[in-house]
């Protein structure tokens, strides 16, 4: 009685939400009721009992094979040395942090943010990013000054499409720089990095868009956009790369309440991109002209073209006024780039298909912890691994090449039974000289079924001990490139698998 | 055993203060929507005010909007409700109920209630 | 607000008696209404939910149905304690609102 119960609970509470949905009914009320209902289910399946448990990952989320790890950490290695290229310190913070640093940090994201069910006392939520933990931590260490990367998983409660590399758990490689400088070289720094990881990741041709919160608020105060809805009108612009400016106009007006000629003036703007000329052009607007914040925007802007070309990455960089990054925290610059997409037609532009790395300037947030709110300028940048790890993978099986998961460099094998204490003692041998070996947990394993497993694991070397050879103190030493094998003295075994593997003098 | 008790009821004069709680114990008190429902006296029940489990939703009725404030505190097991700008209306007993099916807005557990009296 | 109107107001009856009492909501409430009775001095006790679901521990004799606007709270033969006074309550919106109550006195 009580399932059944719980049934017509669930069923009605569907039937409301979908009710509240067909009346417009507010994103808030619509939420409540939709986590009460996702609360029913939740019973209702504890209710099924085990017979019922579907063994998967939770929505949003999913394992990594072998496979997708080493293409992991190809991409992770990359991404690092770049970092430690240009300098950069490691930090490492708490995966839960308390609710009250999280609050008031991203808009409209906020509610995309995981709360953890109270355990004594502490409100806690999950990190949504790791900008924010960063920004709690100087201020709580009282830094000005450092150069960090940190790379951790973050946490969205958002509906995500994982076939587009979108997920409720995924890592963010972040790379920012704190402290006051002259203006524009760190931002321009941040930019050049995005490009070098980027380039060196060979995933395809990427465009950086660049754009600035100063020049948004100014266009939007003389466009005549209320200060009000400010930010909920520049995340309607943020869906510009996504949507046509028809639907987003349509949003604005029909939803945000803004006037059809408001909205119009919006359209002007935000419909230009280009590279330093459109930032010289802008400086000479009649009307954004007249606005301090466009206009120490625009300054920024050109500034920062200078240095993109001394960086020699200014080819790279668009200046684009629909660029709106969503989220509250940034001050100034803000950027995102994108893959392209080869125009199908002849004379079309080049498509964006998602964002792949994005940052900014948000000089106000650490001075949010601070208790006298002392601001400490910071810059930048996020990249969106998920969606890189998505597209090395898609190409490494649309190329069929074979991803080694290991980095074992040789395996010992033996060609007659009863030499296992031999194979244990060389395999040791091996480890402590810093080689990286592997054997076959049999006593007394085929050659056949070694060399199959040495073939199929990509290992570069076998080491096979065989009686005769044990006699004459010699190796075989078989290579799985040439196929050839040569018979190698015991005690310059260490150094000709060095030699064969290009691997310099390391122990453990 | 599964209970909810409230305390913090008496006698105060219209434009003040007063502070209830409710202390629930048996179960699972974070999982659970909270309300307080009043009855003032040879009348009827009127839903006041209630709260989510995790904070994060809250309302009241037009009659308290406000003036009166719910709140809970998971790692006590309390629910509490903060009325300020007390009025004569306000005279009743209330009684905090906690949601069936932890979500549901219907009272499946409620507290013997508590007499608050707004007189001059 | 959704307004809940109960009938009768009061009703006499004897022990072994068969009751109903009606509740009418001023807009449709799919089956979100719940069933309380409610003794002097005592809290409500909940006794159905969702129209016609019956909360565990309450005796089989109560019953209940309806949906949208229309329901009904049925004792199939009563007892002696079920003299008391039932509120039927919407679920559906917030305000949620009870009915004013039916008292069910012994003849």
């Known amino acids: 009685a009580d399932r059944a119960a719980l049934e017509e609970l669930v069923r009605l509470q569907g039937a409301h939400v979908r009710g509240l949905k067909e009346q417009k009914a507010s994103a808030e009320q619509i939420e409540e009721e939709v986590t009460k209902l996702l609360k029913l289910k939740a019973q209702l399946g504890q209710d099924e009992g085990k017979q019922k448990f579907v063994l998967k990952t939770p929505k949003g989320t999913r394992d990594y094979s072998p496979r997708q790890m080493a293409v992991r950490e190809k991409v992770f290695d990359v991404i690092i040395r770049c970092f430690k290229r240009h300098g950069a310190e490691v930090i490492d913070t708490p995966v839960f942090e308390l609710k009250e640093t999280l609050t008031g940090k991203y808009g409209e994201d906020s509610k995309l943010i995981y709360d953890l069910k109270d355990q004594g006392g502490e409100l806690l939520s999950l990190r949504y990013d790791l900008t924010v933990p960063f920004a709690r931590y100087l201020a709580m260490n009282k830094l000005t000054n450092i150069k960090r990367y940190h790379i951790a998983k973050v946490y969205r409660r958002d509906n995500p499409a994982m076939t587009r590399g979108r997920y409720r758990e995924f890592y963010q490689c972040d790379f920012d720089i704190a402290g006051q400088f002259d203006p524009m070289i760190p931002d321009a720094e941040c930019l050049k990095i995005m490009c070098e990881i980027l380039s060196s990741l060979q995933i395809g041709n990427f465009l950086v868009k660049v754009n600035d919160r100063r020049i948004l608020d100014g266009m939007f105060a003389v466009c005549g956009v209320p200060d009000s809805k400010f930010r909920t009108i520049c995340s309607s612009v943020d869906k510009l790369d996504k949507v046509s400016w028809e639907e987003v106009k349509n949003e604005m007006v029909g939803e945000k309440g803004l006037a059809p000629e408001v909205a119009d003036r919006i359209g002007d703007y935000v419909q230009q991109h280009g590279g330093v000329s459109l930032v010289e052009q802008l400086l000479q607007d009649p009307k954004l002209s007249q606005n301090k914040q466009a206009v120490e925007g625009l300054g920024d802007l050109k500034l920062l073209f200078e240095y993109l070309i001394l960086f020699g990455i200014d080819d790279k960089i668009s200046f684009d006024l629909s660029l709106a990054r969503g989220l509250d925290y940034y001050t100034g610059v803000i950027y995102e780039a994108v893959l392209l997409q080869m125009p199908t037609q002849a004379g079309e532009e080049p498509l964006g298909v998602g964002s792949i790395a994005a940052g900014g300037r948000y000089d106000g947030l650490v001075g949010m912890f601070d208790p006298k709110g002392r601001k400490v300028p910071c810059v930048g940048l996020s990249i969106g691994v998920e969606r890189i790890f998505s597209i090395v993978e898609q190409r490494l099986e649309a190329s069929e090449e074979k991803v080694r998961t290991t980095e074992t460099q040789v395996l010992v094998a033996s060609a007659q039974k009863k030499l296992l204490e031999e194979r244990l003692k060389l395999v040791s041998e091996l480890w402590d000289a810093g080689i990286k070996a592997e054997l076959l947990y049999k006593k007394n394993p085929k050659l056949l079924n070694q060399l199959q497993y040495w073939e199929e694991a990509g290992i570069p070397l076998v080491a096979i001990i065989g009686e005769q050879e044990l006699r004459d103190g010699v190796i075989k030493l078989r290579s799985v490139a040439s196929r050839e094998e040569v018979d190698v003295r015991r005690e310059d075994l260490v150094e000709e698998i060095r030699r064969r593997t290009n691997q310099p003098l390391s122990t453990c | 055993q599964v209970q909810l008790v409230e305390s913090g009821g008496g006698l105060v004069k219209p434009g003040g203060s007063l502070r209830l709680s409710c202390a629930a114990s048996g179960f699972t008190f974070s999982d659970y929507y909270m309300t307080w429902i009043r009855q003032a006296p040879g009348k009827g029940l009127e839903w006041v005010s209630y709260i989510s489990g995790s904070f994060r939703y809250t309302n009241y009725a037009d009659s308290v909007k406000g003036r009166f404030t719910i709140s809970r505190d998971n790692a006590k097991n309390s629910l509490y409700l903060q009325m300020n700008s007390l009025r004569d209306e306000d005279t009743a007993v209330y009684f905090c109920?906690?949601?069936?099916?932890?979500?549901?807005?219907?009272?499946?557990?409620w507290g013997q209630g508590t007499l608050v009296t707004v007189s001059s | 607000d959704i307004q809940m109107t109960q009938s009768p107001s009061s009703v006499s009856a004897s022990v072994g008696d068969r009751v109903t009492i009606t509740c009418r909501a001023s807009q449709g409430i799919s089956s979100w209404l719940a069933w309380y009775q409610q003794k002097p001095g005592r809290a409500p006790k909940l006794l159905i939910f969702?129209?016609?679901s019956l909360q565990s521990g309450v005796p089989s004799r109560f019953s209940g149905s309806g949906s949208g606007t229309h329901f009904t709270l049925t004792i199939s033969s009563l007892q002696p304690e079920d003299f008391a006074t039932y509120y039927c309550?919407?679920?559906?919106?917030?305000?949620?609102?009870f009915g004013q109550g039916t008292k069910l006195e012994i003849k």
């Open positions: 309550q919407q679920a559906e919106s917030f305000p949620y609102t």
């Open positions: 109920a906690r949601y069936v099916y932890q979500v549901v807005a219907i009272g499946d557990l």
């Open positions: 969702a129209a016609s």
